[in-house]
Interface confidence: low
C-alpha cells in the first residue's frame, strides 16, 4: 500500500443553516482515473462514515441520493459540503482519499477538519 498526503483545513465553522464546506486536497503520486473520497467523523474515539463518493477524474462526484454530502472536484482538489448539521454533530471530520484504479492502489487520510456547529437561537414568539 502506498501512502499519499491529504490536506484539509484544521477548523471550519458551520453556517447558521447547518452547512459546512471544506476542501480536501491530495497529492496524487500516480495518474488515477478513478478516485474514492470518504468523509469520516471522529467523536469520543468513535469513527463513523458520514458519506462516500466515487468519481472518474474530470467528472462530478456522485453521492447517494440520501447523502448529507455534496461535492465537486477540480484536479486533485475535492470541495466537500455537509448539510443538515446540528450542534450534536460537532466533531472532527476526516477526509480519506483512495486512488482506486488503475493500480497500484494509494490511500491517503487527512488530519481532519474540526467542524463546529452552533444551533441557532429560536426566534421569540411575536404577538401582532
Amino acid at each position: 500500500c502506498k501512502a499519499m498526503h491529504v490536506a484539509q483545513p484544521a477548523v471550519v465553522l458551520a453556517s447558521s443553516r447547518g452547512i459546512a464546506s471544506f476542501v480536501c486536497e491530495y497529492a496524487s503520486p500516480g495518474k488515477a482515473t478513478e478516485v474514492r473520497v470518504t468523509v469520516l467523523r471522529q467523536a469520543d474515539s468513535q469513527v463513523t462514515e458520514v458519506c462516500a463518493a466515487t468519481y472518474m477524474m474530470g467528472n462530478e462526484l456522485t453521492f447517494l441520493d440520501d447523502s448529507i454530502c455534496t461535492g465537486t472536484s477540480s484536479g486533485n482538489q475535492v470541495n466537500l459540503t455537509i448539510q443538515g448539521l446540528r450542534a450534536m454533530d460537532t466533531g472532527l471530520y476526516i477526509c480519506k482519499v483512495e486512488l482506486m484504479y488503475p493500480p497500484p492502489y494509494y490511500l491517503g487520510i487527512g488530519n481532519g477538519t474540526q467542524i463546529y456547529v452552533i444551533d441557532p437561537e429560536p426566534c421569540p414568539d411575536s404577538d401582532f
Epitope: C1, K2, T54, E98, M100, P103, P104, Y105, L107
Partner: nanobody, 126 residues
Framework: QMQLVESGGGLVQPGGSLRLSCAAS????????MSWVRQAPGKGLEWVSS????????YYADSVKGRFTISRDNAKNTVYLQMNSLKSEDTALYYC???????????????????GGQGTQVTVSS
Amino acid sequence: QMQLVESGGGLVQPGGSLRLSCAASGFTFSSYYMSWVRQAPGKGLEWVSSIYSDGSNTYYADSVKGRFTISRDNAKNTVYLQMNSLKSEDTALYYCATPRGAHGPTYCSGGYCYYGGQGTQVTVSS
C-alpha cells in the same frame, strides 16, 4: 491478527477452469478493497484483479480480462477468483490481498505492495 488463507489451486490443462477462494479473518472484511495478485516463477508480482468492498465495481488486468471473474461474499468473509480458459502463462502462485492491511507478510514488486496470505499454486500444463 489479520489473516488471509487461499485455496483452490492445482494442476489443470490449458483451456480448463479453477475457482480460487480466500477466507479472511481478523479484520472487518466488508470494509476492505480486495485484490488477487500473482507471481510466476522467476518473475515479479503482477496485479490480476480487484473488487470494491461492497462488490459494486471490479477491475481486471488486460491479460485476464474476459477469462477471470472476481467476486466476494461479505457474509462469509470470502473473496473468489473464477478462472476460465486457462493458459500456460497463467501458471503462478496466486495471492489474495488487501492493500490496507496492517499485519501479515507484504509483497512488493514493480511498484505494487500488498498484504496477503501464503498463496495457492496454479499450474496450467498439458
